[in-house]
């Protein structure tokens, strides 16, 4: 590492053309973890460019990434998950730019799935449930979920609810009657592990019923 410039202004100028970002996914395939990296500039000519990770690995010093179109990818059990790894972009064996990264701080959970909404007539509410593969995992088990919903006609007016469980109740009185709603959910690590929001789950669409006033009942 002695080749690094020590001047704070210089160090981040280190071949900006090749700046990249990565995310890790733990136990993404059984006990295998994955690491995905990509250049931030989509126009980078990636011909002959390779990625390599060294340090904080089990039994090996370094691992090379596989290239899949414009992304670089590793699937392995060999992440130590403690300490920082050095991830480098290389050409012809020479490093162009490197980043020291702790893989536990760049975790991107898998997207939630099986999102559904059930209307309870007696309770006048909607029970939102979804599933996550992380309930079965041994590392990234604790997540914060972001449930977003909107009236379909309101293009950008998303309402958000954060929760740690996989069940949410929406009160009918807080929704517009006789309206079509879109709802989706994503997740982020929430205990020890840090990182990024997952992809959104597929959206679920549901319609609210009309207001059905009983005799003598007032509109809310």
């Amino acid at each position: 590492e002695s080749g690094y410039a020590q001047n704070g202004d210089l160090e981040d100028a280190e071949l900006d053309d090749y700046s990249f970002s990565c995310y890790s996914q733990l136990e993404v395939n059984g006990s295998q973890h994955s690491l995905t990296c990509a250049f931030e500039d989509p126009d980078v000519n990636t011909t002959n460019l390779e990625f390599e990770i060294c340090g904080a690995l089990v039994e090996v010093k370094c691992l090379s990434f596989r290239k899949l179109q414009e992304i670089y990818f590793i699937e392995t059990k060999k992440f130590l998950l403690i300490g920082k790894s050095n991830i480098c972009v290389k050409v012809g064996g020479k490093s162009l730019t490197c980043k020291k990264i702790d893989l536990t701080t760049i975790v991107k959970p898998e997207a939630p799935f099986d999102l559904s909404v059930i209307y309870r007539e007696g309770a006048n509410d909607f029970v939102v449930t979804f599933n996550t593969s992380h309930l079965q995992k041994k590392y990234v088990k604790v997540l914060m979920h972001d449930v977003a919903y909107r009236q379909e006609k309101d293009e950008n007016k998303w309402m958000h609810v954060n929760l740690s469980s996989t069940k949410l109740t929406l009160l009918q009185r807080n929704l517009q009657p006789e309206a079509m709603y879109e709802i989706k959910v994503r997740s982020i690590p929430d205990h020890y592990f840090k990182g990024f929001w997952s992809e959104w789950s597929p959206s679920y669409y549901f319609r609210t019923p009309e207001i059905n006033n009983s005799p003598g009942e007032m509109d809310p």
Epitope: E1, Y4, A5, G8, E11, A56, I82, G83, K84, Y192
Partner: antibody, heavy 118, light 111 residues
Framework: QVQLVQSGAEVKKPGASVKVSCKAS????????LHWVKQAPGQGLEWIGG????????AYNQKFKGRVTMTSDRSTSTVYMELSSLRSEDTAVYYC???????????WGQGTTVTVSS | DIVLTQSPASLAVSPGQRATITCRTS??????????MHWYQQKPGQPPKLLIY???NLESGVPARFSGSGSETDFTLTINPVEAEDTANYYC?????????FGGGTKVEIK
């Protein structure tokens, strides 16, 4: 080689503030978080907090919150810890330490003795 | 805060013998196989020195006579065989939860 060099000993009066520096060399400054650890005379070790020189983000032990401020200067690869409203219990050796991972300390400064006395 | 209790507080060992220090935590510091427990050696007038990270990983440059083991709430640092230069205080430290806390220390003396 990787080194953390701290500023010299300080003697302060109760109620005053002290600012201790820690200059890093031998590695890329923004690659590792730097933390501060207190060791009172004849006592064990106590984590005060840490700073990420890349972002300036800090994490403080609740016990020191409100009295401690950590800053970094990327142009000189130096981090600072300022401790205010000093009292006699703050008399200690203060170490800066590099975090090799979350959050263990693989490189330590030589320590700075701070004496608080009226 | 997670409390780390080290035992014994002190021990005297003959050169060539085994020294064992234990560290018990008030709650688990493990996430599956990730054990967030670390060990340091501190000699008088010197800063602490990292020996073991992640419960069992030997820090670069540390002699192989130092080893660590354990999981969840019970961890052990072993020095085998002990040498005269190992006279020092030894501390455990957890990093699963802020504030990152240390044990009270174990003083190892060589007979």
């Amino acid at each position: 080689q990787v080194q953390l060099v701290q500023s010299g000993a300080e003697v302060k009066k109760p109620g005053a503030s002290v600012k201790v520096s820690c200059k890093a060399s031998g590695y890329r400054f923004t690659d590792y978080e730097l933390h501060w650890v207190k060791q009172a005379p004849g006592q064990g070790l106590e984590w005060i907090g840490g700073i990420d020189p890349k972002t300036g983000g800090t994490a403080y032990n609740q016990k020191f919150k409100g009295r401690v401020t950590m800053t970094s200067d990327r142009s000189t690869s130096t981090v600072y810890m300022e401790l205010s409203s000093l009292r006699s219990e703050d008399t200690a050796v203060y170490y800066c330490a590099r975090s090799g991972g979350r959050w263990y300390f693989d490189v330590w400064g030589q320590g700075t003795t701070v004496t608080v006395s009226s | 805060d997670i409390v780390l209790t080290q035992s014994p507080a002190s021990l005297a060992v003959s050169p060539g013998q085994r020294a064992t220090i234990t560290c018990r935590t008030s709650e688990s510091v493990s996430i599956h196989l990730l054990h967030l427990m670390h060990w340091y050696q501190q000699k008088p007038g010197q800063p602490p020195k990292l020996l073991i990270y992640g419960a069992s990983n030997l820090e670069s440059g540390v002699p192989a006579r130092f080893s660590g083991s354990g999981s969840e709430t019970d961890f052990t640092l072993t020095i085998n065989p002990v040498e005269a230069e190992d006279t020092a205080n030894y501390y455990c430290q957890q990093s699963i939860k802020d504030p990152y806390t240390f044990g009270g220390g174990t003083k190892v003396e060589i007979k």
